[in-house]
């Protein structure tokens, strides 16, 4: 005999919620695996200028993305299948996973906040290296792609520490076209924008983390309520 009424509503809510979560995990895992194995983008992981490799942050980043996608698919499956099968065992495992993930998120948040300056420094270093590679070896399309992604995402171009040769290339080739950045190159310093992202815009990352945490707590409550509902319905 299955659950009824409000508990049935929770069951399908949990199913839909986790199905979306499972799909999102699949997308992240797919993109991460594509990034890892596509020849054009694989080079980004090993981008280096002379003897200076890309910061570890980026090398590890892809693997973190793969892990996040896999965990999301696994947890999504547990929630999805556990809800539809009304399995206390699967829902219990799902709840435990959420508790662990919640703890991981809190730990990651604290680590990120403590190390935000180092992360910002790594990001700036990576940008500089990609930019240097794009100028010296202009056949390095991967480096150009990185530079253009930075410019378009952060709406910036170059930095005040660049050589005149790099500035020439930026003005003519790598700055976002049609923007006032070209005529006023250093008003939109990418180093400054990266710093702003990790300091001035840190609250946005915080809000996103809080939203995720709230969703997790919400899912924990729903899974526990459903688990109790299943236990109660099996008694009668």
């Amino acid at each position: 005999m299955g659950v009824e009424g409000c508990t049935k509503c929770i069951k399908y809510l949990l199913f839909v919620f986790n199905f979306v979560f499972w799909l999102a995990g699949g997308v992240i895992l797919g993109v991460a695996l594509w990034l890892r194995h596509d020849p054009q983008t694989t080079n980004l992981l090993y981008l280096e200028l002379g003897d200076k490799p890309a910061p570890n942050t980026f090398y590890v980043g892809i693997y973190i993305l793969i892990a996040v996608g896999a965990v999301m698919m696994f947890v999504g499956f547990l929630g999805c299948y556990g809800a539809i099968q009304e399995s206390q065992c699967l829902l219990g495992t799902f709840f435990t996973c959420l508790v662990i993930l919640f703890a991981c998120e809190v730990a990651a948040g604290i680590w990120g906040f403590v190390n935000k300056d180092q992360i910002a420094k790594d990001v700036k270093q990576f940008y500089d290296q990609a930019l240097q590679q794009a100028v010296v070896d202009d056949d390095a399309n991967n480096a150009k792609a990185v530079v253009k992604t930075f410019h378009e995402t952060l709406d910036c171009c170059g930095s005040s520490t660049l050589s005149a040769l790099t500035t020439s290339v930026l003005k003519n080739n790598l700055c976002p076209s049609g923007s006032n950045i070209i005529s006023n190159l250093f008003k939109e310093d990418c180093h400054q924008k990266i710093d702003d992202l990790f300091s001035g815009k840190l609250y946005l990352i915080g809000i996103a983390a809080i939203v995720v945490a709230v969703i997790m707590i919400f899912e924990m409550i729903l899974s526990m309520v459903l688990c109790c509902g299943i236990r109660n319905s099996s008694v009668y």
Partner: antibody, heavy 123, light 110 residues
Framework: EVQLLESGGGLVQPGGSLRLSCAAS????????MSWVRQVPGKGLEWVSS????????YYADSVKGRFTISRDNSKNTLYLQMNSLRAEDTAVYYC????????????????WGQGTLVTVSS | QSVLTQPPSASGTPGQRVTISCSGS????????VNWYQQLPGTAPKLLIY???NRPSGVPDRFSGSKSGTTASLAISGLRSEDEADYYC??????????FGGGTKLTVLG
């Protein structure tokens, strides 16, 4: 030995065209930015054009923009300068030179030069 | 008219120390590294100093370069007759690209 050898110079009438070549030996042309510099006999040096290692970035002096075209064929280890609509003031010795780029993409000058080829524009 | 200004001529006697100046503006010399070339009569230019003060291999240590603000200097100590040549300063400027000075003709007297 690292060398650059220009060819293709000569006498041409105003409005005419000429194509200069610069053959590199002793190094891989495709790894370097390259430039053309000219010098009117008895006068100073004037930069004409520069091209990046894979031709993505190209720059010209205002005096030749729209008339001259720099290009390269890395497989042939050769640099070119196509000169159209030539004027009397384009008369000069044309040098090709290898560009030296240092750490942090700083321009460290032109470290290898050819012997030059004379272009005379006269009717 | 070059945006990098050099004296048209300079002279000195063998063994003497001679300095050639190159002055520009904050947008060219002030914010970029300077390079120096030597052009012996009837030959192609040769890179003498790069990045303000570095000597390529094969260039004697009698030649030295320096830069302060918007002025660069090339110093030749222990002047020799074979140093008689034209000397050019040069920078890469982000707007006008490669820019040469007008050149200085160095004469070794006696």
């Amino acid at each position: 030995e690292v060398q650059l050898l220009e060819s293709g110079g000569g006498l041409v009438q105003p409005g005419g065209s000429l194509r200069l070549s610069c053959a590199a030996s002793g190094f891989t042309l495709g790894s370097y930015w390259m430039s053309w510099v000219r010098q009117v006999p008895g006068k100073g040096l004037e930069w004409v054009s520069s091209i990046s290692s894979s031709s993505s970035y190209i720059y010209y002096a205002d005096s030749v923009k729209g008339r001259f075209t720099i290009s390269r064929d890395n497989s042939k280890n050769t640099l070119y300068l196509q000169m159209n609509s030539l004027r009397a003031e384009d008369t000069a010795v044309y040098y090709c030179a290898r560009q030296r780029i240092g750490d942090l993409v700083v321009h460290y000058g032109l470290d290898v030069w050819g012997q030059g080829t004379l272009v005379t524009v006269s009717s | 008219q070059s945006v990098l200004t050099q004296p048209p001529s300079a002279s000195g006697t063998p063994g003497q120390r001679v300095t050639i100046s190159c002055s520009g503006s904050s947008s060219n010399l002030g914010s970029n590294t300077v390079n120096w070339y030597q052009q012996l009569p009837g030959t192609a230019p040769k890179l003498l100093i790069y990045g303000n003060s570095n000597r390529p291999s094969g260039v004697p240590d009698r030649f030295s370069g320096s830069k302060s603000g918007t002025t660069a200097s090339l110093a030749i100590s222990g002047l020799r007759s074979e140093d008689e040549a034209d000397y050019y300063c040069e920078v890469w400027d982000s707007d006008s690209y490669v820019t040469f000075g007008g050149g200085t003709k160095l004469t070794v007297l006696g």
